[in-house]
């Protein structure tokens, strides 16, 4: 019957994620009992995405690799609301890599998921970015301006933020 086949589909979908995410936290979306959205435990959720704060100190390339083995990417921030959500889980004395880089050092910033870089939706600290050798972006806290972005050398180890689409079952 319909419910049985739906359950079988859900189980096979869950098996796909089991290698890196042995536990999922799911919530019912809307009123329909058949629509569940899930994030790996202990990731946090906001709108249609899941977020993970990685506390290991890694270069930008390795931070992105670390996210990718979990089925995610370094975070792409699309709105002020999204950034406001993310910063609730960050420590003020730490810096975190974003999925934003300038590989050629020509100030052509690009997001890891190919989302177009929009100058109007950026949250650089004042005076940033300021160095052509600093080709990767972090988010950090400055007492004068709170949370914002800064360019940094990609090899300097930092913490990072991973983002993935919610898993719908």
């Amino acid at each position: 019957n319909f419910m049985y086949s739906k359950t079988v589909k859900r189980l096979s979908k869950l098996r796909e994620y089991q290698q890196y995410h042995p536990s999922l936290t799911c919530v019912m979306e809307g009123k329909d009992i058949e629509d569940w959205s899930c994030c790996p435990t202990p990731w946090t959720s906001f709108q249609s995405s899941c977020y993970f704060i990685s506390t290991g100190m890694q270069s930008w390339t390795k931070s992105q690799k670390n996210c990718s083995v979990m089925g995610a990417d370094l975070v792409v921030i699309n709105t002020r609301e999204e950034q406001d959500f993310i910063i609730q889980n960050l420590k003020r004395n730490s810096s975190y890599f974003l999925g934003l880089s300038d590989p050629g050092g020509r100030r052509h910033w690009q997001w890891v998921d190919q989302t177009p870089y929009n100058e109007n939706v950026t949250f650089w600290h004042s005076g940033e970015p300021n160095n052509l050798d600093e080709r990767c972006a972090i988010i950090n806290f400055r007492s004068s301006e709170e949370w914002g972005w800064n360019d940094i050398h990609c090899h300097v180890p930092q913490k990072s933020i991973c983002k993935m689409k919610k898993i719908y079952i």
Epitope: Q58, K62, N131, I152, H153, H155, V156, P157
Partner: antibody
Framework: QVQLVQSGAEVKKPGASVKVSCKAS????????IHWVRQAPGQGLEWMGT????????SYNQKFKGRVTMTRDTSTSTVYMELSSLRSEDTAVYYC???????????WGQGTLVTVSS | DIQMTQSPSSLSASVGDRVTITCRAS??????LAWYQQKPGKAPKLLLY???TLAEGVPSRFSGSGSGTDYTLTISSLQPEDFATYYC?????????FGGGTKVEIK
């Protein structure tokens, strides 16, 4: 050609501090991270931390946090590693190494022997 | 922190021998591994990086392989100048720890 030239040997008393220098030449000093690695007599290698000469950003091995400070002087293309509260176990050869584009240590200094003895 | 366990700690071999040194990481280091050669009183010299890429100027008798947690350095035909101590080092996340070293001595 790329060269990292370190300061000379030091003898220090327990509790004192030592500051070792590493002068870089043959490349753009501010574009590459410098790491510090030490080696106790007859022992293996131990990573201490790194500094980015362009912005001064540092990352230290937790084992040395609070005792190690890495700084740089861009006018002389020199990086410094200062280790405080020295004890006999800190007797070692201290190396600086450049991290190349491939994110590995491609050039090393000749080493600086620091002896801690009362 | 990721620990690196290198074996053997020492070995005796003759010129022309094939020599294999292994390095095991306590976690997946995704091939971010370097091998160094060190001679007494000298700084380490980079031999291989990314587990299997030969550094500039390094003879082709040196090769590396492995993935995940297990890695190998092979010297296909040992030469007199290869008698030295060899170290592995991971670069996955800080601290970038080294293996304990393998001393290759003349038999």
């Amino acid at each position: 050609q790329v060269q990292l030239v370190q300061s000379g040997a030091e003898v220090k008393k327990p509790g004192a501090s030592v500051k070792v220098s590493c002068k870089a030449s043959g490349y753009t000093f501010t574009s590459y991270l410098i790491h510090w690695v030490r080696q106790a007599p007859g022992q293996g290698l131990e990573w201490m931390g790194t500094i980015y000469p362009g912005g001064g950003d540092t990352s230290y091995n937790q084992k040395f946090k609070g005792r190690v400070t890495m700084t740089r002087d861009t006018s002389t293309s020199t990086v410094y590693m200062e280790l405080s509260s020295l004890r006999s176990e800190d007797t070692a050869v201290y190396y600086c190494a450049r991290m190349g584009d491939n994110e590995y240590f491609d050039y090393w200094g000749q080493g600086t022997l620091v002896t801690v003895s009362s | 922190d990721i620990q690196m366990t290198q074996s053997p700690s020492s070995l005796s071999a003759s010129v022309g021998d094939r020599v294999t040194i292994t390095c095991r990481a306590s976690g997946n280091i995704h091939n971010y591994l370097a091998w160094y050669q060190q001679k007494p009183g000298k700084a380490p010299k980079l031999l291989l990086y990314d587990a299997e890429t030969l550094a500039e100027g390094v003879p082709s008798r040196f090769s590396g392989s492995g993935s995940g947690t297990d890695y190998t350095l092979t010297i296909s035909s040992l030469q007199p100048e290869d008698f030295a101590t060899y170290y592995c080092q991971h670069f996955w996340s800080t601290p970038y720890t080294f293996g304990g070293g393998t001393k290759v001595e003349i038999k």
